[in-house]
């Protein structure tokens, strides 16, 4: 079931999913000057069986100017430099998260994809928060949020994280410094109240222990 709202906004913090639950959709967006091929997929979809999950469909972008050129292969190194998504070349989840049953890893890039990835999360998805550079995490509880459904309405739990203005950065789970690693899961809430925060974010991702920045919009 799709989450019909967005993860909460925490001042001076960003979030990311370490793995994507089956049912998650990723829009096939192309960078400026390119468009989806006419018969191309609108979305990639995380699907699977009991033993394996993977992304169905392939996103394909073609030049808006030319009609017949179809490209979908991994960008060449010189093309990667043009994009702000270079960290997506390789898996960025810790092994325990990426191999979570019923979850997909970050999809590989497609040529001429937009610099912003738009995901549509499903109920049960978890995202992890970290403070942006220059801010330090103060924890009252887990720095994570889960999409839950109550009375047919979806909402994200509130991450227990405060970011204070000190020159120290926190890390996502599985990265070298475990300072901001979440501890356990949020307690189940049964309230019918729905609180959502909608926003566009800059998300930091780690790729092969190097952190680069790209833009992701979580819907």
């Amino acid at each position: 079931e799709l989450c019909d709202d967005d993860p909460p906004e925490i001042p001076h913090a960003t979030f990311k999913a370490m793995a994507y639950k089956e049912g998650t959709m990723l829009n096939c967006e192309c960078k400026r000057g390119f468009r989806r091929i006419k018969s191309g997929s609108l979305y990639m979809l995380c699907t699977g069986n009991s033993s394996h999950s993977s992304w169905d469909n392939q996103c394909q972008c073609t030049s808006s100017a030319t009609r017949n050129t179809t490209k979908q292969v991994t960008p060449q190194p010189e093309e990667q430099k043009e994009r702000k998504t270079t960290e997506m070349q390789s898996p960025m989840q810790p092994v325990d998260q990426a191999s979570l049953p019923g979850h997909c890893r970050e999809p590989p890039p497609w040529e001429n994809e937009a610099t912003e990835r738009i995901y549509h999360f499903v109920v049960g998805q978890m995202v992890y928060y970290q403070c942006v550079q220059g801010y330090r995490a103060l924890h009252r509880g887990p720095a994570e949020s889960v999409c839950k459904m109550t009375h047919g309405k979806t909402r994200w739990t509130q991450p227990q994280l405060i970011c204070t203005g000190e020159m120290e950065t926190s890390q996502f789970p599985g990265e070298e410094k475990p300072q901001a690693s979440p501890e356990g899961r949020p307690e189940s809430e049964t309230s019918c109240l729905v609180t959502t925060t909608d926003f566009q974010i800059q998300t930091e991702m780690a790729a092969t222990m190097e952190t680069s920045i790209f833009t992701t919009e979580y819907q």
């Epitope: 799709l2 049912g23 499903v122 047919g152 729905v194 959502t196 909608d198 919009e217 819907q219």
Partner: antibody, heavy 116, light 106 residues
């Protein structure tokens, strides 16, 4: 109490445009997506798309991508849907519905009639 | 797109009858939701997440099913229940509805 009040019925000429409004009250407008649903005469329900009022992100049913444009005005708690290049087959009742999961609140509907 | 096929399209029944409407999805979905609509009115949420009754909905309504096959049942049809019923999935975009089942007086 939650209310979604839509603008009145419209009669339009083929090729013209129409903008339907949906004014929300009784809840925090920016906390819920606003969806739009179409119902042609004697037909079923078709999802058109939604808007996230804060930020204005929209997601459309591909069928309506070139037909509908959904916008929102946070200052007046109002969502809008503009239909362009109207044809007779666009004659329908258009509903707004509050998102956040199942559609628990709906507008009363706006009948758009396209006729020459 | 996930296609939703309701059957029957029209159902003629009398007050007191047990009525069953089925909805078949072209792909497996997490949950089914059901709406009731009366002429000239907006749809009204009836059942959410397959089997849960929306606020104010009488207990004679029930829902069940999983995967691709779902059912709405009215245990004893009342005069107020003559209406059109729609199934709805929101497991994947685009969101889709069944074509509707009209429950009319026999």
């Amino acid at each position: 109490q939650v209310q979604l009040v839509q603008s009145g019925a419209e009669v339009k000429k083929p090729g013209s445009s129409v903008k339907v409004s949906c004014k929300a009250s009784g809840y925090t407008f920016t906390s819920y997506r606003m969806h739009w649903v179409r119902q042609a005469p004697g037909q079923g329900l078709e999802w058109i798309g939604y808007i996230r009022p804060r930020g204005g992100y929209t997601e459309y049913n591909q069928k309506f991508k070139d037909k509908a444009t959904i916008t929102a005005d946070e200052s007046t708690n109002t969502a809008y849907m503009e239909l362009s290049s109207l044809r007779s087959e666009d004659t329908a009742v258009y509903y707004c519905a509050r998102g956040g999961g199942v559609f628990d609140y709906w507008g009363q509907g706006t009948l758009v009639t396209v006729s020459s | 797109d996930i296609q939703m096929t309701q059957s029957p399209s029209t159902l003629s029944a009398s007050v007191g009858d047990r009525v069953t409407i089925t909805c078949s999805a072209s792909s497996s979905i997490s949950y089914m939701h059901w709406y009731q609509q009366k002429p000239g009115k907006a749809p009204k949420l009836l059942i959410y997440t397959t089997s849960n009754l929306a606020s104010g909905v009488p207990a004679r309504f029930s829902g069940s099913g999983s995967g691709t096959e779902f059912t709405l049942t009215i245990s004893s049809l009342q005069p107020d229940d003559f209406a059109t019923y729609y199934c709805h999935q929101r497991s994947t975009y685009p969101l889709t509805f069944g074509q509707g089942t009209k429950v009319e007086v026999k």
